[in-house]
């Protein structure tokens, strides 16, 4: 004979637990029905009657199967430095996350309580560790042979360009300037007209390793004044 299915409320067998989507009510000492997400317990169960559930009111929610007497209040509206990534509904709380260029300085159960702007590394410093949703940018001084000339929360230290002959040596906040050694090539409109380096550098997107392996321009200075290369014009 198949076992009889118990309907809530029912007294559990000693040592057993209630079934899925049921809970044991301490007062009634019975297994009773839970309320589904988006609802709450309007009337608790007794020995003879099951839980009566009701929908959550506006701006309140329950995300779990539950037997709470009142739904939870949704969090306050997102602040100006935040973006609402999940709206308040009867089944879920509002979630606010930090907008681009900001990180979460104080998190809460879900989303962020307090956003702060990402640190900007000043010239001479580059990004050692990029900012994340929950951590600020870490800056580091540009190692010898590298530079950063921007105030930025994303720019890393980049290697100085390598010159045959250096006009102005680079430092932590400025690239090296090369003395032109060949006829100046035409450049794209709007491009910065600098003497042509021996090798062009690609735009790096990762922080340079510490210590930097980029060559230092201090070794590239000529020993004395040198005449301009044939066919070039002095700038």
């Amino acid at each position: 004979l198949p076992a009889q299915v118990a309907f809530t409320p029912y007294a559990p067998e000693p040592g057993s637990t209630c079934r899925l989507r049921e809970y044991y009510d301490q007062t009634a000492q019975m297994c009773c029905s839970k309320c589904s997400p988006g609802q709450h317990a309007k009337v608790f169960c007794t020995k003879t009657s099951d839980t009566v559930c009701d929908s959550c009111e506006d701006s309140t929610y329950t995300q779990l199967w539950n037997w709470v007497p009142e739904c939870l209040s949704c969090g306050s509206r997102c602040s100006s430095d935040q973006v609402e990534t999940q709206a308040c509904t009867r089944e879920q709380n509002r979630i606010c996350t930090c907008r681009p260029g900001w990180y979460c300085a104080l998190s809460k159960q879900e989303g962020c309580r307090l956003c702060a702007p990402l640190r900007k590394c000043r010239p001479g410093f580059g990004v050692a560790r990029p900012g994340t949703e929950t951590s600020d940018v870490v800056c580091k001084p540009c190692a010898p042979g590298t530079f950063s000339n921007t105030t930025s929360s994303t720019d890393i230290c980049r290697p100085h360009q390598i010159c045959n002959v250096v006009a102005i040596p680079g430092n932590a906040s400025m690239d090296a300037v090369c003395t032109s050694t060949s006829p100046t090539r035409s450049m794209a409109p709007g491009a910065v007209h600098l003497p042509q380096p021996v090798s062009t550098r690609s735009q790096h997107t990762q922080p340079t390793p510490e210590p930097s392996t980029a060559p230092s321009t201090s070794f590239l200075l000529p020993m004395g004044p040198s005449p301009p290369a044939e066919g070039s014009t002095g700038d």
Partner: nanobody, 123 residues
Framework: EVQLVESGGGLVQPGGSLRLSCAAS????????VAWFRQAPGKEREEVSC????????NYADSVKGRFTISRDNSKNTLYLQMNSLRAEDTAVYYC????????????????WGQGTLVTVSS
Amino acid sequence: EVQLVESGGGLVQPGGSLRLSCAASGSRLDYYAVAWFRQAPGKEREEVSCITYSGGSTNYADSVKGRFTISRDNSKNTLYLQMNSLRAEDTAVYYCTTEPYGSSCPLSGYDTWGQGTLVTVSS
């Protein structure tokens, strides 16, 4: 729904210490009030300690006050019970259980139960 697994039980001498863990999966533990219960052979299951959903309130049975400490680590989705100055009468199977959004202790009702972990205090 949340599933719970208790661990950390064992044999300990009177006056000794143990730390029980209750690891949750299937849901975030910080949505729940969580309680430790124990059941000694031939006795009723009793609530030993409870921590509310917000973590703002804890409660202890008189028999363990000053000796046991309940805590939770939401980042690890785990509940703990630090048990010091253990006595022979603390011997029992220890269970954790939950109440969604539970705002007061003791719990008004119980949700899921773990399988329990046995604590034996004996010399």
